[in-house]
Structure formats: C-alpha cells, structure tokens
Interface confidence: medium
C-alpha cells in the first residue's frame, strides 16, 4: 500500500536501531572513502528527520522518496568532488538517474587498508565504553569494503559480533575467547559477501528472470514438499528483496525480508516441516536461520520426472501454451528431487531441456526427438562430479595451503595477464573450497563446491571487468553466469602469453617477513609463486616445487639467524640465482 511518508513508514517498521544501522550501511556503501564520523553525523540527521515525519507525515519533505532524501544528503557533503572525483557528477542528475549513477560508482576493490582487528584488551575497552559506536564502526568498515553486502545480513553479523564481545570481554583470557569466535564470524561474513555480490551481478547483468530461476531451484531443493505455486511465491519475494538491496534500497529490502520471514513462519504447513526452530527467534536471527535452513525431507512418492516432461504426449503443447511456467515446473520438479546438485547445474539442465524442446517441438516427430533428453543430461552431471572428486582428492593430499598453491599455479597459467594480487586473492579463496566443502557428506559436496566456486569466480570477473587484461577471462566472464565455472575449468595454459622477464627485485626479501602473521607470510610466498609462473608459464610441477621449497628453507633459515638482515642480503641473491637455474 502507498504511504504518505516512505521514510516514516520504514522507521516505524524497522525500529530506530535497525533503521540507523541500515542508513549507516547505505552511506558507507555509496561513499566508501568517508570517515565514520562524517557518516554517523549524516545518519543522525536522517534519523532526526525520520522522527519528525513519524510525528507528522505532512511535515515538509516527508513525502520525498528515500533515494531523494539520501541523495540530497550525500550531495550536500562538502568537498565531494575533491574526494570522489566524477562521482560528484551524479549530483547534477535527477532521481532515479542520480541513484543509478551512485550505484555505477561503487568500487568493488576500494583502495582501503585491510581491516586490522585491534588487540583483545583494546577491543574490549572500546566496546565496553561505547558498544553502539564500536558496532557502528564495524558496520562502516565492512560496508565500505563490501559495497554490495546484503544489508540485513550485515546487521545480523554485527549482532553476532556484539554477542561474542559481550561474552568474551568478561573472560580472563580475552584473546583466547575472542580470536576463534571472531575468526568464525569473519569467515562466514566474507563468504556471505561474495555470495551476495554474485546475486547482484546476476540481477545487474541478466535481470530478474535469471535471478528468479536461481531462486526457484534453490527453494525447490530446500522445500521439496511445497507446491510449485508456493515455491514461485517465495522466489518472487526473494527476487524483489535482493533487487532492492542490490539497488541500494536497503530500508525497503530489510523491511520486506522481515515480512517474508513472517509469512514463512505463518505458513509453515505449506512450506516445510523444518522451520519451527527458526520461527521462535527474534527478527534478524529468524531471517538468517530461514536463509540457512536445512533441506526438508523429499516426499517418498514422487513419480519419475520423465512422466510429465518426456513421456507425456502433450509436452510440446504444454510448453507452447506457457513456456515460462512449463520450464518453471520442470526446474521445480528436477530441483526438489536433487538437493545433491548445485543450483548452477540445475540451471544448466533446465537450459538444456529448453533448448531440446525448442528444437524438437519444431520437428516432425517431437517425442522421438526429445525422448533421449534425460540421457543427454548425463555428461552435464558428470563434469562437476568429476571436478569435485579430483579437487577434493588433491585437497586431501596437499592440505589447504598446498591446494591453494596448486590452484594458483593453474589459474596463473590460464590467465597470466591478470594482476598478481588478484590471482593470489582468487586462488586463496578458491583453495578454501577444500576446507569448506570436501569434509562434508558426499551428497552435500557438489552443491557446496560448485556454488562456492561460482561466487568466487564472479568476484574475479568483477575485478577483471574494472581493468580487463585477459581475453580468456573476458570470454568466460561475458557468458552466462551458470556457464562461468565450466568455462574457467576448461581453460588451459595461455599460449599467446609472452613470459614476463625475470626481475630479481620481485624475488628479493627482507627480514620484515619474519615478523609477519602466518597468513601474510603465505601471501608473500604465493605472490612469489605467481610471479615465477608468469616468468615460466610452462614450468613443471617438480620445478616449481623445488624453487618454492628452496624459498621456504631460505626464509626459515634467515628468520632463525642472529643477523637476519645480513642473512637476507647475502643468501637472497644466491636463492635468485638457484631459482633461475632450476627454471632454465
């Protein structure tokens, strides 16, 4: 229904705390360089204004759209052009073009230092002194680094952060309590960030229809007892919610997400038997719980998929009458039977089925033509199954770090033109798939592996799009979202690449490496590995192993030496010479 004042309506629905959090996220995602203090001032002004509109919906400007109100606030920032350059040009536009312009200027790789977690004691002190400000900083720092982070989910992670600090800051060994718990929250949040970026990419590049197909497949896997119309209702709502968040309508997005959770909890009987535990929780936890819900049990009496979609004599008639609905029912029926498949695979199968009907229904004997379609699915199913098998075996053999290195070599050979930091980031993330998925039961491995890889590769595409350097990457990234992962998997060594000349300084290290945390040490070594491959793209596994082993020994030896600087200075050139020789 229409409201006189949109901002008053959202304030009342969301409550002050969530309203302020969401406004802070919105501003931080639009203007990623502004300090916290500047944003929090704007948030307070917007909140005060919203309160006046709650008191009197007819007050001046209360009837303006939220985009107009937010945009006017952002455009009033002094020195906007000095800090943001051409983003300031957006302010000359009218809504909705102005908001579109802001969205286009979101930076997926902002030039911000990595978020450093303070010492446990310092964290607890600032948390206890001002929890609201502490959590505000958290929202600001995450949102500006991840401008597409799903806002209501970020509020949930802030709540988790709050819980961990509340619990651990009373312990005697604060660090021992905080570190593993905050690491777990961080890991989940980083995965959530790449997953949501993939959803926004899907929406931006391929529109609502493609996203809705993704949602139908996902919902059908989770809720196999729900009827098709119920699944499409949920998919329609989820599509709307994601469109709003991806489009910067964070208040509407969070409000609609809460509404959907309410609907699901009121209609458990027609959706799933697994919802009750989620429905007893407060709003943020309820929505998150529902988003992560385990699959309901598949109905025992499901007939073969072939009955309606291959053997039925009216397949072509049903398809012709309403293509979208018929293909939707196919996707629903196939997905509810296959929680063990990735959504990407299910969408590839639906695409294959559609192409088969398009071809066969125009021929003289359609049933003979489409009669073998299910058998033709087999290679499409086998390909990702083999991918999971070989990669999980490799992960089990090498461990996470070794597996990351294998992936790094593979991807540097596929796309050596891509910048080393981007390759290292992608390989480290791709390599985490082992830890995340390979330890799961067999039936959960494929969906975990492929859908996670797709999200990570989307991040690679988003970064590459900013500065395109590899034709092969551009080709894989330009195609359909569901074909990306198979496209990258199929890439081989780029034969057109002219190897990088050997630069000694790239492989020159100093004693500062010794004091780095393990993760940073790994990144240094992986940076060197990528550079080695760029120098020698056809180096064998054994050659690379020799050089990297030598390098690890060198670092280890010099970090244990009494005069570290001297060791690095004298041993370094020897290492470089040996490496050149080993790779000759």
């Amino acid at each position: 229904e229409a409201h006189k004042s949109e901002i008053a309506h959202r304030f009342k629905d969301l409550g002050e705390q969530h309203f302020k959090g969401l406004v802070l996220i919105a501003f931080s995602q639009y203007l990623q360089k502004c300090p916290y203090e500047e944003h929090i001032k704007l948030v307070q002004e917007v909140t005060d204004f919203a309160k006046t509109c709650v008191a009197d919906e007819n007050a001046e400007n209360c009837d303006k759209s939220i985009h107009t109100l937010f945009g006017d606030k952002l455009c009033a920032i002094p020195k906007l052009r000095d800090n943001y350059g051409e983003l300031a040009d957006c302010c000359a536009k009218q809504e909705p073009e102005r908001n579109e312009c802001f969205l286009q200027h979101k930076d997926d790789n902002p030039n911000l230092p990595p978020f450093q977690r303070p010492e446990a004691e310092a964290m607890c002190t600032s948390f206890q002194e001002n929890p609201t400000s502490f959590l505000g900083h958290y929202l600001h720092e995450v949102a500006r680094r991840h401008p597409y982070f799903y806002a209501p989910e970020l509020l949930y992670y802030a709540e988790k952060y709050n819980e961990v600090l509340t619990q651990c800051c009373t312990e005697s060994d604060k660090a021992a309590c905080l570190t593993p718990k905050l690491d777990a929250v961080k890991e989940k949040a980083l995965v959530a960030a790449v997953r949501q970026r993939m959803k926004c990419s899907s929406m931006q590049r391929f529109g609502e229809r493609a996203f809705k197909a993704w949602a139908v497949a996902r919902m059908s896997q989770r809720f196999p007892n729900a009827e098709f119309a119920e699944i499409t209702k949920l998919a329609t709502d989820v599509t709307k919610i994601n469109k709003e968040c991806c489009h910067g309508d964070l208040l509407e997005c969070a409000d609609d997400r809460a509404e959907l959770a309410k609907y699901m909890c009121e209609n458990q009987a027609t959706i799933s038997s697994k919802l009750q535990a989620c429905c007893d929780k407060p709003v943020l936890q309820k929505s998150q719980c529902l988003a992560e819900i385990e699959h309901d049990n598949i109905p025992a009496d499901l007939p073969s998929i072939a009955a309606d979609f291959v053997e039925d004599k009216e397949v072509c008639k049903n398809y012709a009458e309403a293509k979208d609905v018929f293909l939707g029912t196919f996707l629903y029926e196939y997905s509810r039977r296959h929680p063990d498949y990735s959504v990407s695979l299910l969408l590839r199968l639906a695409k294959k089925y559609e192409a088969t009907l398009e071809k066969c229904c125009a021929e003289g004997d359609p049933p003979a033509c489409y009669g073998t379609v299910l058998a033709e699915f087999q290679p499409l199913v086998e390909e990702p199954k083999n991918l999971v098998k070989t990669n999980c075996e490799l992960y089990e053999k090498l461990g996470e770090y070794g597996f990351q290195n294998a992936v790094l070599v593979r991807y540097t050979q596929k796309a050596p033109q891509v910048s080393t930091p981007t390759l290292v980031e992608a390989a480290r993330n791709l390599g985490r798939v082992g830890t995340k998925c390979c330890t799961l039961p067999e039936a959960q491995r494929l969906p975990c592996v492929e859908d996670y890889l797709s999200a990570i590769l989307n991040r690679l595409c988003v970064l590459h799009e900013k500065t395109p350097v590899s034709e092969k990457v551009t080709k894989c990234c330009s195609g359909s979202l569901v074909e990306r992962r198979p496209c990258f998997s199929a890439l081989t060594v780029d034969e057109t690449y002219v190897p990088k000349e050997f630069k000694a300084e790239t492989f020159t290290f100093h004693s500062d490496i010794c004091t780095l945390p393990d993760k940073e040490k790994q990144i240094k070594k992986q940076t060197a590995l990528a550079e080695l491959v760029k120098h020698k793209p056809k180096a064998t596994e054994d050659q690379l192993k020799t050089v990297m082993g030598d390098f690890a020994q060198f670092v280890d030896k010099c970090c244990k030496a009494a005069d570290k600087d001297n060791c690095f200075a004298t041993e370094g050139p020897n290492l470089v010479a040996r490496s050149k020789e080993a790779l000759a």
């Epitope: 009827e227 119309a229 119920e230 209702k233 309606d308 029926e333």
Partner: nanobody
C-alpha cells in the same frame, strides 16, 4: 467434499468483457493455489491462469497475457477471472480448479461455465 461452482459465462461480442466467479467449499481455500482452465469445442484442456493462495504471484498462459486478470477473495472463498478484449478463440467452457501439490495437473474442477465470443 470439494465443490467448485463457476458462474458468469455468456455470449459476448469480440472486444467485450466478462467476469467469471467460482465459489469454493469443502477444503481450506486460503491455503490452496487455484487456477482457471478452459476447453474449446473439440479441443483438449488448456490452462489459463494460476493464482497463489495469498493472491500473488499470478501466472497466465501466453495467449491471455495482458487481457485476463485472475484474483481471489479468501474471506468469501471465491476465485475470479476478469476477461477483457475477448476474441473468438477465447470461446470455451471455463473451469476453475484447485491447484495440485505439483505438476500442471488439476486435482478437482467444477462443472464449468460457457463463454461464447461471437458477433
């Protein structure tokens, strides 16, 4: 016992409008998705439109998109089909049906109401 009673059919000129109603009883209407199907003389059943239990979303066969609107009033246990810009090829017996738990098959339908579009 499930009962579905359609009404509102009749003779109408091309370009004209009609509103069909379907009174439902014997099952929980507000938790059931519903649809309209039709059967033209000498032809098979063709589905026309589906509506979710809550009223949205709705789906239409390509042949009626933009001309027909399905709606429901859960407080009255009634399903509606507003038909505008009617064409000769819309001539058929229209049935309302309870949507099944899966697949585009129809669990129950009424006795139907005849719509004739002719000048």
């Amino acid at each position: 016992e499930v009962q579905l009673l359609e009404s509102g059919g009749g003779l109408v000129q091309p370009g004209g409008s009609l509103r069909l109603s379907c009174a439902a009883s014997g099952f929980t209407f507000d938790t059931s998705s519903m649809l309209w199907v039709r059967q033209a003389p000498g032809k098979g059943l063709e589905w026309v439109s589906v509506i979710h239990q809550s009223g949205t979303p709705t789906y239409y066969a390509d042949s009626v998109k933009g001309r027909f609107t399905i709606s429901r009033d859960n407080s009255k246990n009634t399903l509606y089909l507003q038909m505008n810009s009617l064409r000769a090829e819309d001539t058929a017996v229209y049935y309302c049906a309870k949507f099944p738990s899966s697949r585009m098959k129809f669990d129950y339908w009424g006795q139907g109401t005849l719509v004739t579009v002719s000048s």
